[in-house]
Each structure stands twice: as C-alpha cells, then as structure tokens.
C-alpha cells in the first residue's frame, strides 16, 4: 500500500522567497505512479494544483498562475517536491500531496493524501529561538492514590508558527498512546499548547515520552520530552533519567524542586 | 463547473447515536462521477473513508456507510455509532477515474462539514479535581464530569497569567478539563470548580500524609547542573513534593 509522508508540518518564508515542500512516497515505486498536489486555503475548498505522472508529464490546473508552481520528483529518494516561487500572502495554505493507490480488487483505486504542509509567510526574518519550550508536570499524589492512575502534562510555550504535533509513547515502544490536548493559544507574538496523558497505575513505573514535531525544533528532528518513571509512594531516579537525550542528542536536564 | 455542497457546515453528534452527512452536486448528474469521502482530523491528517463501489479505508467499514441518492443528486455518509475519535471535518470529493472517455483523475472537493462529538445524555457526575505544579506554573486537572458546563478557578493572590481551560471528552464518554496558569505564589495555589451548582475543591482530594515520610534533599541537590557525567540523586522524594521540569540545552 502506498504511504505519503510530508516531513515538514509547516514551512515559514518571508515574502518573495521560494518555498520547497517535500513529499516522500513509500510502499510504491514513485516512478510507477503519479503524484498530485492540492492546496487548501483558510475557509476554501481543497483545490487541485499540479501533478507529475509516472512518465514525468506535468499537468497544471487551469487558472493557476503560470510560473508560480513547479513540481518534480527524485526517484533515488522517492520524493516529489512542490516548489512555490515568489511566495506571497495568497499562497498561504496547507499543501497536500496525494496518489492513487490500487486496492486488492482489480480496478478499485483510492486516493491517499499526505499529512500536509502549512505554508506560512511573514514579513520579518525570525532570528529568535521560536522552538517549543517544554515544561513537564507529574501526577499529583492525590490522583495516584485515589484513582490508581496518574496524569502527565506536557506544556509547550513560546513557539512560532502555530503548527505543532504532539503525541505520547512509552519508552521502547512505538505505540502512540491516547492523549488529550488543549487548543493552541496565542501569547503575545508566539503560541502555547499543552497535552496530557492519563495512565493506569501499572504504567506509572514506565518512562513516558512527549514527542513534539515543530518546524523550528533544533536540527529539524522531533523533540522528545522525558517523563521519568513514578512509584506511587516514592519517586526514585536512575542515573539514566538524568541523562535522557532527545532526538537531537541534547542533554535533558531534570530539575527537581522540593517544597518544605 | 460542478460544485459539491455539504448540507450543513457543522453537525453535532452524540456518542453512539447514528448521524448522516449529505453532500449535493450542483451543475452535473452525480451518476457521472465517483464520490469519495475523507475526514480531516486535528493536525490536518486527511484520511480516506469511502469511495463508491463499496471501497472503505482501513478501519472504516464497520462504522461508516456510504451511499448515493441518484434521484436527489446527492451523496450520503452515515456514521453508524459515532465515538469521540470521529470528530473532525468531513469532505466529499468526486472524480471520473476509470469511467472511460475524457476522465479526470483529480478530485474536486466540496467544503468541509465539521462534525463535533458530544457525550450522550447521562446522569450527572461530579468531577475529581487535582492540582499539578512546576515552578510558577500550575495546572488544575478536572476529571470525569458531566454535563459540560463548568467554571474552573485557580485561587491565588498573585496571578501572573491564566489561560482558557481545555475541555475534552474523556475516553469513558464524560468530560475532562485542564486549566493552566502562572502564579508567583504557586505553592499556595488551589483549584475550585463550580459544577452542577456545587463547588468542588482540589483540597477535598488531597491525601493526608505523615510529614516525617518526606526526605528533603540538601539545597545543592535541588537542581542538577549540566554535566557530562550523571549522578544518582541521593534523595528519595515523595511525588506530591516533586515538580519536574525538563529543558533542552
């Protein structure tokens, strides 16, 4: 089955620059399929823009400004790229790549979409660090005692743009855990968001990770915020818990405050 | 030019109660096109649900049913037993792929229908209220309440800032909420909740513990300095006395 990944969840550009949006195709040979690009402006219908067929033929939707969009594909990396030239306010949108995927039954096809990349245009170069800044909250003793469960909360602040994805996993597991989150909120010129995970008592002694995807994460990789294991009576920390690394291989410091 | 028009902009549905979405085609006969349905969830993920000729996306066949009403020139999607996972924007889209002659393999989309999911009507449930703290940050966690109307108040004399609460459906079909704030006196902040004409305090849920149980680390052990080597903390600390903050350096 074909699968599409758009590694950039957002792409922030200044006016008149060029944006390159990537789409990685897996489970199907890119040179044996056509890749389609769609655009969704705020409040508008999703609209087909351009496609590149298996033989390299490019087809553009009528009414799309000439010279604005360019599409290509690189078979070696199984990637299709949509290039948007001379970006301007009217180009602000979420861009999706898509392809037709054959089903088991002959003649039956479905069109699958990538997760989308939001193009953001600003009039100033952002030089400050606008990656999400994490703060973690551990379960209250009252919750663990009374409800035999504990809630971890992951607060992310001072990020720009507003596009962010948060999910939770146990350490050494790729299973995404069911979590809940608040809306992304504007705070001055940046944004904040929080996500929380409630786990049963039996999982409290496992290490949990809040995994954050954001355009401005250091080195462009997902940020992993480590939540240490908890014993319902006491919390002990192994040496490794003070040396947890995120995906950027940066040292995660665990700061412990104790109140008298 | 053809246009796909959803019947409603927003459709509120109750958990477990079947719901129907409709999408009419203007300017053409719907029979000349294949109809598709997609769902866009938080985070923009566009997931295929249904395509004419009984094709369903993985995990959708049991809970969704697609249909075409040729006479009324509209497409129908039934959600047989909605759950909180079904919240999102639903799009109808059409194409003529494989119909022979002049076909279009691009999809023409309609505007989305926002499906909001609410718990089914049930007996009123009083919330549990817990406070979580880290530095100046305080979170009030309000769990498993019904109905939705609630006022969450973080009680402090030294407020820096407060944020609107997040209220979501819990996995059990009730509501959970979190309210965050920053306070100079975070240690003394409590949370009180008005729900169903009653007030519930976080202090109602506090566990009374013997203060001799607590091991207080020495001052130098309160924070870990950046270090290439790692040292095991000497103290074992009760969780209600701990706030953890992780930062990247």
């Amino acid at each position: 089955a074909g699968h599409l990944e758009q590694p950039q969840i957002s792409s922030t550009k200044t006016l008149s620059k060029t944006a390159r949006l990537e789409c990685v195709v897996s489970g199907i040979t890119i040179s044996a399929t056509s890749v389609y690009w769609y655009r969704e402006r705020p409040g508008e219908v999703i609209q087909f823009l351009v496609s590149i067929s298996y033989d390299g033929t490019v087809r553009k939707e009528s009414g799309i400004p000439s010279g604005k969009f360019e599409v290509d594909r690189i078979p070696e990396t199984s990637t299709s790229t949509l290039t948007i030239h001379n970006v301007e306010k009217q180009d602000i949108a979420t861009y999706y790549c898509a392809l037709w995927e054959a089903q088991q039954e002959l003649g039956k096809k479905i069109k699958v979409f990538g997760p989308g990349t939001k193009l953001i245009i600003t009039d100033k170069q952002l030089d400050a660090d606008v990656s999400p800044k994490p703060t973690i909250f551990l379960p209250s003793i009252a919750e663990t005692k009374l409800q035999k469960a504990g809630t971890y909360l992951c607060l992310l602040e001072k990020f720009f743009p507003d596009v962010i994805k948060i999910h939770w996993q146990e350490k050494k597991s790729n299973t995404i855990l069911g979590s809940q989150e608040g809306n992304t909120m504007k705070t001055n010129d940046t944004y904040m968001k929080f996500s929380w995970l409630t786990v049963p008592e039996k999982s409290l002694d496992k290490e949990h990770r809040c995994i954050v995807r954001h355009e401005n994460n250091k080195n462009g990789v997902d940020q992993e915020i480590i939540f240490p294991p908890i014993k319902t009576d006491v919390i002990t920390m192994d040496p490794k818990d003070n040396c947890s690394k995120d995906a950027n291989d940066t040292l995660l410091l665990q700061l412990t405050n104790t109140s008298a | 030019a053809i246009e796909l028009v959803p019947e409603h902009q927003t459709v509120p549905v109750s958990i477990g109660v079947p719901a129907t979405l409709r999408c009419s085609m203007k300017g053409e006969a719907i029979g000349n096109y294949y109809i598709n349905w997609y769902r866009k969830t938080q985070g923009n993920t566009m997931t295929f649900i249904y395509r004419e000729k009984d094709i369903y996306g993985p995990g959708f066949k049991d809970n969704f049913q697609g249909d075409i009403d040729i006479a009324k020139n509209l497409a129908v999607l039934k959600i047989l037993a909605p759950s909180e996972r079904d919240e999102g924007s639903y799009y109808c889209a059409c194409d003529t792929l494989g119909m022979g002659g002049e076909y279009t393999d691009k999809l023409i989309f309609g505007k989305g229908t926002r499906v909001t999911v609410e718990p089914r009507s049930q007996p009123h449930t009083k919330p549990s209220v817990f406070v979580m703290k880290n530095g100046t940050n305080v979170a009030c966690l309000v769990k498993e309440f019904y109905p939705k109307d609630i006022r969450i108040n973080l009680v402090s004399s030294k407020k820096i800032t407060e944020f609107d609460p997040a209220i979501v459906i819990s996995p059990s079909g009730k509501y959970n909420a979190v309210k965050l704030g920053k306070y100079e006196d975070s240690n003394s902040v409590t949370c009180s909740v008005q729900h169903d004409n009653k007030t519930v305090h976080s202090t109602d849920f506090e566990v009374k513990t013997d203060s001799t149980d607590h091991v207080k680390p020495k001052e130098t052990e309160n924070t870990k300095q950046p270090s290439k080597s790692c040292h095991k903390p000497k103290a074992i600390v009760h969780t209600e006395k701990v706030n953890m903050m992780s930062l990247t350096v």
């Epitope: 006016l15 008149s16 402006r41 705020p42 409040g43 508008e44 400004p65 010279g67 604005k68 001379n86 301007e88 306010k89 009217q90 602000i92 953001i120 245009i121 600003t122 009039d123 100033k124 720009f160 743009p161 507003d162 504007k186 010129d189 940046t190 944004y191 | 902009q9 505007k111």
Partner: antibody
C-alpha cells in the same frame, strides 16, 4: 505616517478611458496585496479589483471584468487602475487600499488597513 | 458570489448605549477573511476589525467583533459621539468578488 494618495480622476464621456494612480509613501508597496474599492454617490462600498504583492494573483469584480486592468510598479511604489469603456454606472469615488501585511502571529488575516483619500471619477455625456 | 447582508439598515441610539450590528453571509466565510469598517461622511473607510474578532491598530476596546460561519456581529459597548457613522462588513476570502455588506448607519437618537 503611512499614506496612499490617489490621482487621475476626472470627468469622462461614456466609452472613454482613464488611468488612476495610487502612490504609496512611508511603506514598501511590494510587501502588500493592493485593492481598488469604489463608492457611487450616496451608495455603499464596492470592491473593484485586487493584485497580490508580486502580481501573480489578480482579481476583478464581474462589473468591471474585461474593461479595467489593475497593475503595480513596485519600483515606483505605485498602483494603477486602467479603466476603459467607461459607463455612467462607473461614476464613483475610487479608493486604493492596502491589505494587512503578513507579519506577526495573525499573518493570514485579511482586511484593508490603509486607505487613500479617494479620487472622483464622473462618467457623463 | 457570496452576498453579505447587514442589519439593521439604520440604528438610532443615544451616546452611552450599546450597539449591536449584524452581518450575514449567503455562504460560510472563514473568519480569517471577515473585516469591519467605519466610514464617516466625506472620509475614507477605516478598518476596525479583521479576522472577525481582532481589533486593528489604534481601535478602542469598546469595539468588538464575533461570529463564525455565516453570522458575524460588531458590538460597540458604549457609544461615543464620534462613533456615529456607517459600518460595513466585508468578506475578503474564498473566490472574488470580495464583497461588502450594504452598510448599517448608526445615528444619534
């Protein structure tokens, strides 16, 4: 203070032509989408045309399509409206107006935040 | 074409009173694209609200906007003498034309 100044209005016979200009001062025109809006005597506002910052996207109201042409010269910090085949119903005060920029956190919101004082076009025989 | 309909046509109020102006779109409009303007006789319009609810620079906080989808509202919490004017809503999105409402005149009672 950021300003827009229209010129080129006047009296013209039906079927005639006029070219309106709009000079921007104290801001860089090339960073903004620009619009023309008109107001007939005693009537409400009517959007006429818009042009994106690098001229890729150009839109017209149906009432002027095929007769009016919007253009811009970013080097001269100026916006233009070429009006041909003028009709009596084109009589109005013509305003040029700047759309909000793309800075800050609300980069995708629209709204005409700077307006000129208007130039009057009268089409009459 | 999206048609914007404002109501009432005229609102007669006294200074200090609250004014509520309504704007209805013939089809759904993204809040990103909804703006309100004030125009006084002989002057160019002035942007009050953009994004349905965000106040433009220098606009007093007695002006507020709300709404989504097809129904939008401009509220002036306490009318000042300088607030008596004509108010227009405009949708600036979807496909052109970027239509204005026909206007609501707020006059002194």
């Amino acid at each position: 203070e950021v300003q827009l100044l229209e010129s080129g209005g006047g009296l013209v016979k039906p079927g005639g032509s006029l070219r309106l200009s709009c000079a921007a001062s104290r801001f860089t025109l090339s960073s903004y989408d620009m619009n023309w809006v008109r107001q007939a005597p005693g009537k409400g506002l009517e959007w006429v045309s818009s042009i994106s910052s690098s001229s890729s996207y150009i839109y017209y109201a149906d009432s002027v399509k095929g007769r009016f042409t919007i253009s811009r010269d970013n080097a001269k910090n100026s916006l233009y409206l070429q009006m041909n085949s003028l009709r009596a119903e084109d009589t109005a005060v013509y305003y040029c107006a700047r759309d909000r920029g793309v800075g800050g956190t609300d980069y995708y919101y629209y709204g005409l935040d700077v307006w000129g004082q208007g130039t009057t076009v009268t089409v009459s025989s | 074409e999206i048609v914007m309909t404002q109501s009432p046509g005229t609102l007669s109020l006294s200074p200090g009173e609250r004014a509520t102006l309504s704007c209805r779109a013939s089809q759904s409009v993204s809040s990103s694209y909804l703006a309100w303007y004030q125009q006084k006789p002989g002057q160019a319009p002035r942007l009050l609200i953009y994004g349905a609810s965000s106040r433009a620079t220098g606009i007093p906080d007695r002006f507020s906007g709300s709404g989504s989808g097809t129904d939008f509202t401009l509220t002036i919490s306490r009318l000042e003498p300088e607030d008596f004017a004509v108010y227009y809503c405009q949708q600036y999105g979807s496909s052109p034309p970027y239509t204005f409402g026909q206007g609501t005149k707020v006059e002194i009672k």
